[in-house]
């Protein structure tokens, strides 16, 4: 796979993953509760990082934010923070990678600068993906360990039904957002790794840039302004007729330097 293709694919995969991380963070179905068949209407409860929702069998849905809750655990706050950090790093990674893409020309940016930017964006995507995966995994662990609530009956006043309080739903299950988050985090991570691999291909190899000089014995060889390519017929590709003149370079000529083949 060419460097450009690897870099471009890595960027696209990371972009898809990043979009998934945003979607997961905003989704309400991080945890769902077993359908509760109330005699009046079937009720389906589900909860996200920011609000809790209830959907009735009629289709009516009501969501309420957690700002009225008295006790938000530190672990939920940590999951929120991890997802937000993942999004922020993803945004920075996307901005950096856009400038780092080999197929995009910005000023006189050389390959070494693009390589560094590609590596930076790759690392940002990797960290972003890891943040999302850890965040979702921590939430899933909270569900598994903490959310199996035993039915509690608390009686007050007279016996029988009077003043009774009991839990309605006792079981929490994984919501769709968890799976979206895991997949999205994985994609972002894979995209970041691909960007890092592409960086290696972009890094200039020192052996390509050493000046070459040939000494012909017994005769003076005149300097050719056109360089080796012009004098020998090499590089007569009609697509790339511009010889280095200090201006813009085409993609195929981007490793040409004024000192590369100036002496024959």
């Amino acid at each position: 796979m060419s460097v450009t293709a690897c870099q471009g694919l890595g960027f696209v995969v990371s972009l898809i993953g990043f979009a998934g991380i945003i979607a997961a963070t905003c989704m309400d179905q991080w945890s769902t509760q077993d359908l509760y068949n109330n005699p009046v209407t079937a009720v389906f409860n589900y909860q996200g990082l920011w609000r809790s929702c209830v959907r009735e069998s009629s289709g009516f849905t009501e969501c309420r934010g957690y700002f009225t809750l008295l006790g938000l655990p530190a672990m939920l706050q940590a999951v929120r923070a991890l997802m937000i950090v993942g999004i922020v790093l993803g945004v920075i990674g996307i901005l950096v990678s856009i400038f780092a893409l080999k197929c995009i020309r910005i000023g006189s940016m050389d390959d070494s600068a693009k390589a560094k930017m590609t590596l930076t964006s790759g690392i940002l995507f990797i960290i972003s993906g890891i943040c999302a995966i850890i965040g979702v995994s921590v939430f899933a662990n909270m569900l598994v360990t903490n959310f199996w609530m035993s039915t509690a009956n608390m009686y007050s006043g007279m016996g029988g039904m009077g003043g009774m309080v009991q839990t309605v739903q006792t079981r929490y299950t994984f919501g769709a957002a968890l799976f979206v988050g895991w997949v999205a985090g994985g994609l972002t991570l894979i995209g970041g790794v691909m960007m890092c691999i592409a960086c290696r291909g972009l890094t200039p190899d020192d052996s390509n840039f050493k000046a070459v000089s040939y000494h012909a014995s017994g005769q003076n060889v005149a300097y050719r302004p056109g360089g080796f390519k012009a004098s020998t017929g090499f590089g007569s590709n009609t697509r790339n007729k511009k010889i280095y003149d200090g201006g813009a370079r085409t993609e195929d000529d981007e490793q040409s330097h004024p000192t590369k083949y100036d002496y024959v």
Epitope: T41, N45, E56, M149
Partner: nanobody, 123 residues
């Protein structure tokens, strides 16, 4: 601590009317369904009428056409307007609320019952 308190019960003549009120209080995050159940002496508890947040209502066959349930979501209160009362409507009427408490996360959904209010229909 969350609780529901009923009021409005009492003695009424056949054909008369009564309006029962039930207010939920405490650390309430949201209420899904509020309803009225009744239990006559020696009989099992039965649903009289219920109403969901979305406005879905359900009535027992014996209550249809005579009883009307309504709800004030802002006040966490449910009302049961009972008309054309019959002696067989005599029972202890219990308020029931399926609600979420605001004391913890994840949101815990509880089924809360009131102490009950006695409705007696007698000449």
């Amino acid at each position: 601590e969350v609780q529901v308190v009923e009021s409005g019960g009492g003695l009424v003549q056949p054909g008369g009317s009564l309006r029962l009120s039930c207010a939920a209080s405490g650390s309430i995050f949201s209420i899904n369904v509020m309803g009225w159940y009744r239990q006559a002496p020696g009989k099992q508890r039965e649903l009289v009428a219920g109403i969901s947040t979305g406005g879905t209502t359900r009535y027992a066959d014996s209550a249809k056409g005579r009883f009307t349930i309504s709800r004030d979501n802002a006040k966490n209160t449910v009302y049961l307007q009972m008309n054309s009362l019959k002696p067989e409507d005599t029972a202890v009427y219990y308020c029931n609320a399926d609600l979420a408490t605001a004391t913890s996360w994840p949101v815990r959904y509880l089924e809360v019952w009131g102490q009950g209010t006695l409705v007696t229909v007698s000449a």
